[in-house]
Amino acid sequence: VLEVYYTSLRCRCVQESSVFIPRRFIDRIQILPRGNGCPRKEIIVWKKNKSIVCVDPQAEWIQRMMEVLRKRSSSTLPVPVFKRKIP
């Protein structure tokens, strides 16, 4: 549910939201680290209704959710949570 992508594209997010999304309505989360043409970290959330929203990385709820997902992934190996795609 949590993915990290390294991409050569510039910033994907034009607008960011801090609005809370319950976990049951999240399909997956994509993290784009800063660099490679974009000066900021970006978080893209796919909702269960197929819509996509960019989430403010400073939003407290997304930070908490990612921490929970990281902890869960480390305790449920070998299922990978972070997928790294190098262009």
Partner: antibody, heavy 119, light 107 residues
Framework: EVQLQQSGPELVKPGASVKISCQAS????????MNWVKQSHGKRLEWIGD????????TYNQKFKDKATLTVDKSSSTAYMDLRSLTSEDSAVYYC????????????WGQGTSVTVSS | DIVMTQSHKFMSTSVGDRVSITCKAS??????VAWYQQKPGQSPKVLIY???HRHTGVPDRFTASGSGTDFTFTISSVQAEDLAVYYC?????????FGGGTKLEIK
């Protein structure tokens, strides 16, 4: 304009069942979860559960899983709630309410259906 | 289940006053909290979502804050039409749960 039109008041006997309807208009019915909420005379609101009209998937509050059954009829954009084995504890106003995909609270509510259980 | 506690069942205030209603969650709900207004004889209406975001068309005298377990809903200058019951609701985890409601009475 989004509207949720609920069926009229019900007076039923203990042990009986009742089916409440909620007809939606003004939006794509299949695209939004429909919630059901109970409001007893003590005024507290209780979430019964929700249904995804797109795939008929339901999530119930465990408290109501043996009491309520949620269904939809996509052809008429109508959500239904069946309540069974009714007792005086089930006397309440029942609301249908649409879940917002923008902010995940309930953004549109029906006018409520009053159910009175009495012999 | 997550219990949402509104400590005051009734609050009495005067037109023009500032009033704050509190809501406490029994466990961390992040910012997954909404506030609803229910006027006499009407259905509930969402005012605030995601703990602090005002819904479209809601007057700016209504504000809210909080995160984790403690939440506050404020009316900066109460109007006569604000006579209603106000409910908090968590939508962090199912079953979604509501506070017991706070009835705002106008003196």
């Amino acid at each position: 304009e989004v509207q949720l039109q609920q069926s009229g008041p019900e007076l039923v006997k203990p042990g009986a069942s009742v089916k409440i309807s909620c007809q939606a208009s003004g939006y794509a019915f299949s695209d939004y979860y429909m919630n059901w909420v109970k409001q007893s005379h003590g005024k507290r609101l209780e979430w019964i559960g929700d249904i995804n009209p797109n795939n008929d998937g339901t999530t119930y509050n465990q408290k109501f899983k043996d009491k309520a059954t949620l269904t939809v009829d996509k052809s008429s954009s109508t959500a239904y709630m069946d309540l069974r084995s009714l007792t005086s504890e089930d006397s309440a106003v029942y609301y249908c309410a649409r879940l917002s995909w923008s902010f995940f609270a309930m953004d549109y509510w029906g006018q409520g259906t009053s159910v009175t259980v009495s012999s | 289940d997550i219990v949402m506690t509104q400590s005051h069942k009734f609050m009495s205030t005067s037109v023009g006053d500032r009033v704050s209603i509190t809501c406490k969650a029994s466990q961390d709900v992040s910012s997954g909290v909404a506030w609803y207004q229910q006027k006499p004889g009407q259905s509930p209406k969402v005012l605030i979502y995601s703990a602090s975001h005002r819904h479209t068309g809601v007057p700016d005298r209504f504000t809210a804050s909080g995160s984790g377990t403690d939440f506050t809903f404020t009316i900066s200058s109460v109007q006569a039409e604000d006579l209603a019951v106000y409910y908090c609701q968590q939508y962090y985890n199912t079953p979604w749960t509501f506070g017991g409601g706070t009835k705002l009475e106008i003196k």
